[in-house]
């Protein structure tokens, strides 16, 4: 007969390690007992447990509550044990010694490695603003044993660079994602993906990009100049811009205060029934935390079209 085992066993920190030891023998052979020990530098070998075919499992005091048999059904030739709640101090070599009848004794050694899975963290970079050059969007750090893999998953065009720092039996990996900010990136997800053999699946942390920008301002409402005549009701000028954060709007008149009855409502300037006093240069001011923009238009209110003598055919925008 022979022992079926594994010379390398890997377990995740905090989980149960199965230390395999199965005797593959002839049908008439029996396993009397299996002795488990840890190969210890000071004491040679330190007993963990004794599995007896008749008397069952006896665990040494040092490993009380930490060693058990795998759940049933159990094969009488299977001397495997579970080491519960593995910690890094459990790393090392273990030995199973199988006493069989009539074939005698067999022994096998295996190495236990304990994986420490990472707990990744994502840190956004400084505020992103359109017009900046290559800028740090986010960094992602993960430390584990062995070294984790840190990558980025995104539709956004950018460059990733990583650095790692090794400690004994573990490594901290930091990956940075740099990009040239543009408004099209607003609201786009940037996902840090961390892989490690101690994780059942990749860990993903998503950061939503926010790029500050302010578009050029323009004014709508003067497209048909002939509509701007004395007596017209419901005339409005609308200031067009967009930004992140959303901009605030303000209206002024270049050559004096806004005429009475002219109302500012957000991005829109509303006029009462038009008179020639409403002619003038109007300025739309747009601003957010990033920047400010302005656009001005010249309004000329035409005389009553029913009075040809007073008609002025001039409306201009600049």
């Amino acid at each position: 007969g022979e022992l079926e085992t594994s010379d390398l066993v890997t377990v995740v920190l905090g989980q149960d390690a199965k230390l395999p030891c199965f005797y593959r023998g002839d049908p008439d052979e029996q396993v009397g007992q299996v002795a488990w020990a840890r190969v210890d530098p000071n004491e040679g070998t330190r007993e963990l447990a004794l599995l007896h075919s008749k008397y069952g499992l006896h665990v040494s005091p040092a490993y009380e509550d930490r060693v058990e048999q795998p759940p049933p059904p159990r094969d009488p030739l299977d001397g495997s044990i579970l080491l519960r709640n593995a910690v890094q101090a459990d790393e090392g070599e273990y030995e199973c010694r199988v006493s069989t009848f009539p074939a005698g004794s067999f022994q096998a050694r295996m190495r236990l490695r304990v994986l420490v899975p990472p707990l990744p963290s994502l840190n956004p970079g400084p505020p992103l603003e359109e017009g900046q050059g290559l800028t740090l969007a986010a960094s992602c750090t993960a430390e584990g044993s062995p070294a984790p893999s840190v990558t980025w998953d995104t539709e956004v065009k950018g460059t990733q660079s990583s650095r790692s720092f090794k400690h004994s039996r573990s490594a901290a990996v930091t990956s940075e994602f740099h990009l040239v900010p543009s408004r099209s990136m607003n609201g786009q997800p940037l996902t840090c993906v961390v892989s490690h053999p101690g994780l059942l699946q990749d860990q993903r942390i998503t950061h939503t990009l926010q790029v500050a920008f302010l578009a050029e301002a323009s004014v709508r409402g003067l497209e048909d100049q002939n509509l701007w005549h004395v007596g017209r009701e419901g005339a409005t000028l609308k200031c067009l811009s967009e930004g992140q954060p959303p901009p605030k709007y303000n209206w002024t008149r270049l050559d004096g205060p806004l005429p009475s009855g002219v109302r500012v409502k957000g991005d829109t300037l509303g006029f009462p029934p038009l008179t020639t006093e409403h002619s003038g240069v109007y300025v739309c001011h747009v601003s957010n935390e990033l920047s400010s923009r302005a656009s001005q238009v010249t309004v000329e209110v035409l005389a009553d079209p029913e009075d040809p003598g007073k008609q002025v055919d001039l409306v201009s925008a600049s």
Epitope: L8, V39, G92, A147, S149, T151, S164, S168, R169, V173
Partner: antibody, heavy 116, light 108 residues
Amino acid sequence: QVQLVQSGAQVKKPGASVKVSCKASGYTFTGYYIHWVRQAPGQGLEWMGWINPNSGGTNYAQKFQGRVTMTRDTSISTAYMELSRLRSDDTAVYFCAREDWDFDYWGQGTLVTVSS
Amino acid sequence: EIVLTQSPGTLSLSPGERATLSCRTSQSVSSSYLAWYQQKPGQAPRLLIYGASNRATDIPDRFSGSGSGTDFTLTINRLEPEDFAVYYCQQYGSSPITFGQGTRLEIK
């Protein structure tokens, strides 16, 4: 700084044994496994096995079972690899390497020539 | 055992060019368990990349590693004269530890 310094080149006759040493410095010797890797002339790297300097536990590649013995002396931070019943195809450079999952530091290598 | 197959066997390039070396594994290997080494004539191997993509201490950033599962790549941007050597990949996730057969990077 971390260093692994190996013993000098040796010439052996077929059937003899060779023992190569690997002295570690610059770190805690018992804190890292030591592996042995060999490289025949013009060939690639071949893993032979490891020793845990802390426990003295070993694991050998199947190919070398029964012919290789790895030992250590913690008092002088030195690991040893002994290969017996030498054949001409054991002519190679033998390296020791420190394991930190990967092999982050290597000895300079020891050329063992097996020739009658 | 896990078999690592490197390609090409030999790569002839000029300084300043980019080298792309491949390592395929016969079974899936966690990226945390894959390393790349550089070896120059008469010298010991030197760790370049560990965990598939992490540069070892003092390795220039023109060296980068990537890949997962069974396909891994070592890329060397802007080749320098000192980069011409033999490169090995290695898996250390299961026993026995295994190496690829190597890729020789030579000057064209």
